[in-house]
């Protein structure tokens, strides 16, 4: 996702350092502070149907929010994929699709977006209280994954009740990636700054631009190893019913489309429904950062019960292997 | 030397069922998904379908989803494709292909089993 | 479906010349395609997968290019080996589906 902040103005130093350090030295630190309040997290979104007319039948919708290139989405359902879940689905941007039954069709919507239609017959149809998951891997994000589900009414004409639903996860490769260069370099700015400022660096505070606008946060050293360490994992509860959209969505906007960034505004073609269902006005929406905010003692200002946080137990090379199907 | 055996050519009555074989020698079966791909004489190829020898799951073109039958036998790293009701429709050669994950294409066939339907 | 068209049935060449196969895939596919050599009395094997990229042990006379809906298998350098059926194949999105095949002959 991109995230915006309003940074305050920051004096050069003077120019006694100017001449101390050298001024290679201090092309870094304001390449780094760049680097630092640009850089984004990246965000899973999951929407999990039921068809009103085939009530067995399920579409799950899965978009990724993030600047970098998606390499590979997989679809699973049962739990996360590698963590006890089946594949249904591995979607690659240039290279295509393989798909497992119940799945019968699943596409690219758009760039960052993608569709799985599932049948309702046979025994391997998906049962009502099934999770589903979609992980994206992405360069130079890392892999990123969010699920959702649908509970246990079939009844179109009943709203079931909340069930515990999406769940965003951020493995630690991209975290430990570039990221980690960006953390080291944020730390050392830091160091330097407070070294030759004979000053505490400038704290940078988080600020909204506008109602739907993420929230930044900078991160002082001590959350940021703490961010590198901890993958967060982040539970909120959902309702759903058939014919209803349930997200997993960085943002409580008022439709589906119009609460995309930018780069994936433009409407993918599919059925008009879609996209003019609204999402329901408690729309939470999940986000990596809230772990990050958890990590620093604050509530997260928009997850709902039952915020959990761990790492994921497979570590930094779980996308490493062969696409596809392993 | 990654090898993929299919079982011998089959002479089959109409309405009735066969089950060819593909046994996988070379590499770790479960590593890769099974395709199976029909040739009728002298037409094209035809994408039956595709089974993940790790869990079971499936693949089926629609258009033969009531035809065909997937499975595998992971003790023997035997791929296995039931067909049923027959017809001379069915009378083809049929091809076991390995589905390589890395690079995204077919990259070793068998030899092929040719199915005749005749009564 | 997504149809893959190969307009030429036939096509007649020379050993030293250069021919090229065309398929042209009713929709989008990216450069998810493949092309697949079938010799007379063989099965198919793998000559070009994902557009451009050459399968193990495929000499380099054999190249690929294109992507979205227009693909091109060039053999230049033809020998009489290569006299066989031509087939491409698209992976985008499933049920996969062939092209109808081409032929080469050797005059």
């Known amino acids: 996702m991109r995230t915006e902040a309003q940074v305050p103005a920051l004096q050069p130093p003077e120019p006694g350092l100017e001449g101390a350090m050298g001024h290679r030295t201090l092309v870094l630190p304001w390449v780094l502070l760049t680097l630092c309040v640009t850089a984004g997290t990246p965000e899973v979104w999951v929407q999990v149907r039921m068809e009103a007319t085939e009530l067995s039948s399920f579409t799950i919708r899965c978009g990724f929010l993030g600047s970098g290139s998606i390499s590979l989405v997989t679809v699973s359902w049962g739990g996360p994929n590698g963590a006890g879940g089946t594949t249904l689905a591995v979607l690659h941007p240039e290279r295509g699709i393989r798909q497992w039954a119940p799945a019968r069709q699943a596409r690219w919507e758009t760039q960052s977006s993608i569709s799985l239609i599932l049948e309702g017959s046979g025994a391997s149809s998906p049962c009502a209280n099934t999770t589903f998951c979609c992980k994206f891997a992405s360069f130079p994000e890392g892999s990123w994954e969010a699920c959702g589900s649908l509970p246990p009414s079939s009844d179109p004409g009943l709203s079931a009740p909340p069930t515990p639903a999406p769940i965003l996860r951020a493995d630690l490769a991209g975290i430990l990636g570039v990221s980690g260069v960006l953390l080291f370099g944020c730390v050392y700015l830091l160091h330097l700054l407070r070294r030759h400022k004979h000053r505490p660096a400038p704290r940078l505070q988080p600020s909204r631009t506008s109602p739907q606008a993420p929230r930044a946060r900078a991160w002082a050293p001590s959350q940021a190893s703490q961010a590198a360490l901890h993958v967060p994992y982040a539970t909120i509860n959902t309702s759903c019913r058939p014919a209803t959209l349930d997200t997993a969505h960085p943002h409580g906007g008022p439709s589906w489309w119009a609460s995309l960034p930018t780069h994936a505004a433009h409407r993918p073609q599919g059925p008009a429904a879609w996209a003019s269902t609204p999402i329901p006005a408690r729309g939470s929406f999940v986000s990596v950062e809230n772990g990050l905010y958890a990590q620093a003692g604050e509530r997260p200002p928009h997850t709902g019960p039952g915020l959990t946080l761990f790492p994921d137990p497979r570590g930094p090379r779980a996308m490493e292997g062969p696409l596809g199907v392993r | 030397e990654v090898q993929l055996q299919q079982s011998g050519p089959e002479l089959v009555k109409p309405g009735s069922s066969v089950k060819i074989s593909c046994k996988a020698s070379g590499y770790t079966f479960t590593d890769y998904n099974i395709d199976w791909v029909k040739q009728s004489h002298g037409k094209s190829l035809e994408w039956i379908g595709a089974i993940d020898p790790n869990n079971g799951g499936t693949n089926y073109n629609q258009k033969f989803k009531d035809k065909a039958t997937l499975t595998v036998d992971k003790s023997s790293s035997t791929a296995y494709m039931e067909l049923r009701s027959l017809t001379s429709e069915d009378s083809a050669v049929y091809y076991c292909?390995?589905?390589?994950?890395?690079?995204?294409?077919?990259?070793?066939w068998a030899t092929g089993t040719t199915v005749t339907v005749s009564s | 479906d997504i149809v893959m068209t190969q307009s030429q049935k036939f096509m007649s060449t020379s050993v030293g010349d250069r021919v090229s196969i065309t398929c042209k895939a009713s929709q989008n596919v990216r450069i998810a395609v493949d092309w697949y050599q079938q010799k007379p009395g063989q099965s198919p094997k793998a000559l070009i997968f994902?557009?451009?990229n050459r399968h193990t042990g495929v000499p380099d006379r054999f190249t690929g290019s294109g992507s979205g809906s227009d693909f091109t298998l060039t053999i230049r350098n033809v020998q009489s080996e290569d006299l066989a059926d031509y087939f491409c194949?698209?992976?985008?999105?499933?049920?996969?589906?062939f092209g109808g095949g081409t032929k080469l002959e050797i005059r």
């Open positions: 194949l698209q992976h985008w999105i499933s049920p996969y589906t």
């Open positions: 292909t390995r589905w390589d994950s890395n690079d995204w294409y077919f990259d070793v």
């Open positions: 994902s557009s451009s």
